[in-house]
């Protein structure tokens, strides 16, 4: 059999090997595709499949429009003039090349030594579904899953049996100084098909600089609430990336999922202490916040005690 | 919203002519193929003739083939058929209606035109 | 010619009742069948397009299915509505064939 390949929407001929160019013609088509469970004998008088499948003059059958249901294989048994039987047959695949892919949501720079998204490059409209592959400074990047980390999802268009396809890309860039240059490309993994590549972004990689700080701001300011109320207390770092910040409560750690925010809904005589944040940096070790004090007590009560934050409601170090 | 609208039925004698027309609209009409049905009083469903999409391709059952023909204006949205050496079994009300071929089967159906053949 | 069987030709049915109409093929039409619902001096409404599928605007409680050649209609709780008369159709070959037709009826 001989393997074709058709783009969507396109037409395509096949023809029938060993048929009379002209009638009379003994000649017979069958097909087996997405629009069939088994095989369907077209008529050669031509009827309600020729929108999808025609016998033309010729023997010949033309798909005006082929589609994804057109996929499967074509078989046409002729007589030729002197009496012999001829088969042909077609295993028709179809191909839809997408629009050029882009990166969406790239980055502006990257930090040496930790993990950095590039961005996510997406292709939409393709069939098959086809790959996208990474590129730096015009090399493949092979995904290692530590250094290079690629996450990927597909799509299909449940009305256009269409494909898009989105993958991000995270590094970690070793050095700082240098200008890598990313880009993305998309293959339908089709022969004589050249890959779609995106523009290329360059992007900065800057050495990570230690957090400036860290600032612990209470609500209500000056810590000092009633019973019930509610405390929120935010640690506030500049650093990028966001460090994991864990929570000290009169200087034992508390068994919380690392959170930038601590809320205190409800409170009581028991949550009355001193309290810290702990963010810790992958490039520069743990960093704490200076102490707040939060005291309990009825409305009418004195101003801040001693030790407690002061009237802004924060503490920073430098 | 797709519309099928039928027109020019009316009292015929046995031998005579006449010209249906139907106007469609709210479809891309040289998207579809259209197709004529026909009903006689109390009976059930007929297919009368289908048309592919461009004009080029029709199609007839044996009792109407050689006397009617289907055709069709692109540009002005509009379905015809030519009914020539009508009989009296050819009486009904007559619909036009979008489709015909695998793809669509016959999906919206206009309210019909009644041709009567008779002395 | 294909011929499309279409049974029973009538049937009494109440308002709740299940109502099961069937069109048997005299060869194979694959998916390609269409359910329709005629009322009395109205046209054709298209129920169930290539066997199973429900069209735009018709209620849940029409449903198409198909077991190789015999095709089927099932309304799963007949509404004062229902009562009409329905026709199966065949768009596989010419000539487009239809069925005789099942007439509704109140009990």
């Known amino acids: 059999g001989q393997n074709i390949t058709a783009r969507i929407g396109e037409p395509l001929v096949l023809s029938c090997k060993g048929a009379p160019k002209k009638p009379p013609q003994q000649l017979e088509w069958k097909l087996n595709t997405g629009r069939t469970e088994a095989w369907k004998v077209l008529s050669p008088q031509g009827g309600p499949w020729d929108s999808v499948a025609r016998i033309l003059p010729n023997g010949s059958l033309l798909l005006p429009a082929t589609g994804i249901v057109d996929e499967g294989t074509f078989r046409c048994r002729a007589t030729n003039r002197r009496g012999k039987e001829v088969k042909s047959n077609y295993r028709v695949r179809v191909y839809q090349i997408p629009g050029k892919p882009e990166i969406v949501d790239p980055a502006s720079e990257l930090t040496a030594s930790v993990p950095n998204k590039v961005g996510t490059c997406v292709s939409e409209g393709s069939y098959p579904a086809g790959t996208l592959s990474w590129h730096l400074d015009g090399k493949l990047l092979i995904p290692d899953g530590k250094e290079t980390l690629v996450k990927e999802e597909t799509r299909r268009h449940p009305e256009t049996g269409l494909f898009t396809l989105r993958s991000e890309l995270t590094v970690i860039p070793t050095q700082g100084g240098t200008h890598p240059t990313f880009s993305c490309s998309f293959s339908l993994g089709l022969p004589r098909r050249r890959p779609l590549n995106t523009a290329p972004i360059q992007l900065r990689v800057r050495e990570p600089g230690p957090p400036e700080g860290i600032q612990l701001l209470v609500e209500p300011e000056g810590g000092i609430v009633a019973p019930g109320g509610t405390v929120t207390l935010t640690c506030a770092i500049s650093a990028q990336p966001p460090p994991q910040v864990h929570w000290i409560k009169d200087g034992a750690p508390l068994p919380l999922a690392p959170s930038p925010v601590l809320l205190l809904p409800e409170v009581g005589h028991e949550d009355e202490g001193t309290y810290s944040c702990v963010a810790t940096h992958p490039s520069h070790g743990p960093q704490e916040s200076p102490p707040v004090s939060i005291r309990v007590t009825e409305t009418g009560d004195e101003g801040p005690a001693e030790g407690s934050v002061g009237e802004s409601g924060l503490g920073t170090l430098a | 919203e797709v519309q099928l609208v039928e027109s020019g039925g009316g009292l015929v004698q046995p031998g005579g002519s006449l010209r249906l027309s139907c106007a469609a609209s709210g479809f891309t009409f040289n998207n579809y193929w259209m197709t004529w049905v026909r009903q006689a009083p109390g009976k059930g469903l007929e297919w009368v003739a289908s048309?592919?999409?461009?004009?080029?391709?029709?199609y007839y059952p044996d009792s109407v083939k050689d006397r009617f023909t289907i055709s069709r204006d692109n540009a002005k949205n509009s379905l015809y058929l030519k009914m020539n050496s009508l009989r009296a079994e050819d009486t009904a009300v007559y619909y036009c209606t979008r489709g015909g071929d695998i793809t669509t089967g016959l999906d919206y159906w206009g309210q019909g035109t009644l041709v009567t053949v008779s002395s | 010619d294909i011929q499309m069987t279409q049974s029973p030709s009538s049937l009494s049915a109440s308002v709740g009742d299940i109502v099961t109409i069937t069109c048997r093929a005299s060869q194979d039409v694959g998916i390609y069948v269409n359910w329709f619902q005629q009322k009395p001096g109205k046209a054709p409404r298209r129920l169930i397009y290539r066997a199973t599928n429900l069209a735009d605007g018709v209620p849940s409680r029409f449903s198409g299915s198909r077991s190789s050649t015999d095709f089927t209609l099932t309304i799963s709780s007949l509404q004062p509505e229902d009562f009409a008369t329905y026709y199966c159709l065949e768009f596989d070959e010419h000539p487009l064939t239809f069925g005789g037709g099942t007439k509704v009826e109140i009990k």
């Open positions: 048309i592919d999409n461009s004009g080029d391709n029709t």
